[in-house]
């Protein structure tokens, strides 16, 4: 069971300092941006991180949403990352959900975050280069110290 708490506005970057944004095709991508680029591209660069209480002690449960024309929420259904047109629900009556991730601070690096899927244990949000695009994907952690699954989260509130 997950119950919604508060939400905050955040900019999410990979460890190469590329900014996460949602493109015109609703795809989550990373791109080099200056601070002014980041501001100019809002609201596509501003993510709503909603926190949830969890009935089990597993970590800080969150959803990641963006509000362009409508609110879309990040999902990892079938291990495929996509934004679904939906508001983060107030309650989720299950112990797993495709839209719930556990936000984890890497030990020894308080400012580095990982997002583990609640549906697929051991699978994390990651940045992966595909041709010329840097995409947000769901990835099984396969090597120690994998930088692709680490992000910084800057609060914009």
């Amino acid at each position: 069971y997950f119950g919604k708490l508060e939400s905050k506005l955040s900019v999410i970057r990979n460890l190469n300092d590329q900014v996460l944004f949602i493109d015109q095709g609703n795809r989550p991508l990373f791109e080099d941006m200056t601070d002014s680029d980041c501001r100019d591209n809002a609201p596509r660069t501003i993510f709503i991180i909603s926190m949830y209480k969890d009935s089990q002690p597993r970590g800080m449960a969150v959803t990641i949403s963006v509000k362009c024309e409508k609110i879309s929420t990040l999902s990892c259904e079938n291990k495929i990352i996509s934004f679904k047109e939906m508001n983060p629900p107030d309650n989720i009556k299950d112990t797993k959900s495709d839209i719930i991730f556990f936000q984890r601070s890497v030990p020894g690096h308080d400012n580095k975050m990982q997002f583990e899927s609640s549906s697929y244990e051991g699978y994390f949000l990651a940045c992966e280069k595909e041709r010329d695009l840097f995409k947000l994907i769901l990835k099984k952690e396969d090597e120690l110290g994998d930088r692709s699954i680490m992000f910084t989260v800057q609060n914009e509130d």
Partner: antibody, heavy 119, light 110 residues
Framework: EVQLVQSGAEVKKPGSSVKVSCKAS????????ISWVRQAPGQGLEWMGN????????YYAQKFQGRVTITADESTSTAYMELSSLRSEDTAVYYC????????????WGQGTLVTVSS | DIVLTQPPSVSGAPGQRVTISCSGS????????VNWYQQLPGTAPKLLIY???HRPSGVPDRFSGSKSGTSASLAITGLQSEDEADYYC???????????FGGGTKLTVL
């Protein structure tokens, strides 16, 4: 770097209560879990329970259920552990520990507070 | 009350490799991650290994963790005198809905 600073040593009478504090400085407090772990003289570690300050959710080890109360004050970034109906076997060093990665991965520890229960 | 079983003591000469075992059951290690802590004499414990085999920053790569079935182990290579300490394994036990520690292993560097 987060630092957890605990209150000083206590000497208590059997049957009384003790309240130990744990103040966090230099980092985020509210969205992570704070656990309490105790260690009797010459013995191993024993988890008592934890709290997630942001939600106020608490989880207690069955052994301490009904005798321990863990609270947190977000405004002062301080967590508290109160243990009641003290007996001599409760003589131990009590540690607070922060869990930022997972509620059960204790990545930062306080210096410990010695509680002695003696008549 | 101790659910995870560790040897009370191990020893090794400087430069040697030692391992510390931690045995549990399907209700804890068999289905959950294992963490390891080092406690130097007179100090608070320190996180050494988390999620079976991950090292926090600042922990030397001489320390490594592994898990197989319902057991886990901590390996220390190139043993140094400053490694002399108590080592504890930890996991989640869903039968007691509680986190559990091993009884601890005292490492002596000869």
């Amino acid at each position: 770097e987060v630092q957890l600073v605990q209150s000083g040593a206590e000497v208590k009478k059997p049957g009384s209560s003790v309240k130990v504090s744990c103040k966090a400085s230099g980092g985020t407090f509210n969205s992570y879990a704070i656990s309490w772990v105790r260690q009797a003289p010459g013995q191993g570690l024993e988890w008592m329970g934890n709290i997630i300050p942001m939600t106020g959710q608490t989880y207690y080890a069955q052994k301490f259920q009904g005798r321990v109360t863990i609270t947190a004050d977000e405004s002062t970034s301080t967590a508290y552990m109160e243990l009641s109906s003290l007996r001599s076997e409760d003589t131990a060093v009590y540690y607070c520990a922060r869990a930022a990665y997972h509620p059960l991965v204790f990545d930062n520890w306080g210096q410990g507070t010695l509680v002695t229960v003696s008549s | 009350d101790i659910v995870l079983t560790q040897p009370p003591s191990v020893s090794g000469a400087p430069g040697q490799r030692v391992t510390i075992s931690c045995s549990g059951s399907s209700s804890n290690i068999g289905n959950h991650y294992v963490n390891w802590y080092q406690q130097l004499p007179g100090t608070a414990p320190k996180l050494l290994i988390y999620r079976n085999n991950h090292r926090p920053s600042g922990v030397p790569d001489r320390f490594s963790g592994s898990k197989s079935g319902t057991s886990a182990s901590l390996a220390i290579t190139g043993l140094q005198s400053e490694d002399e300490a108590d080592y504890y394994c930890q996991s989640w036990d869903y039968s007691g809905f509680s986190t559990v520690f091993g009884g601890g292993t005292k490492l002596t560097v000869l």
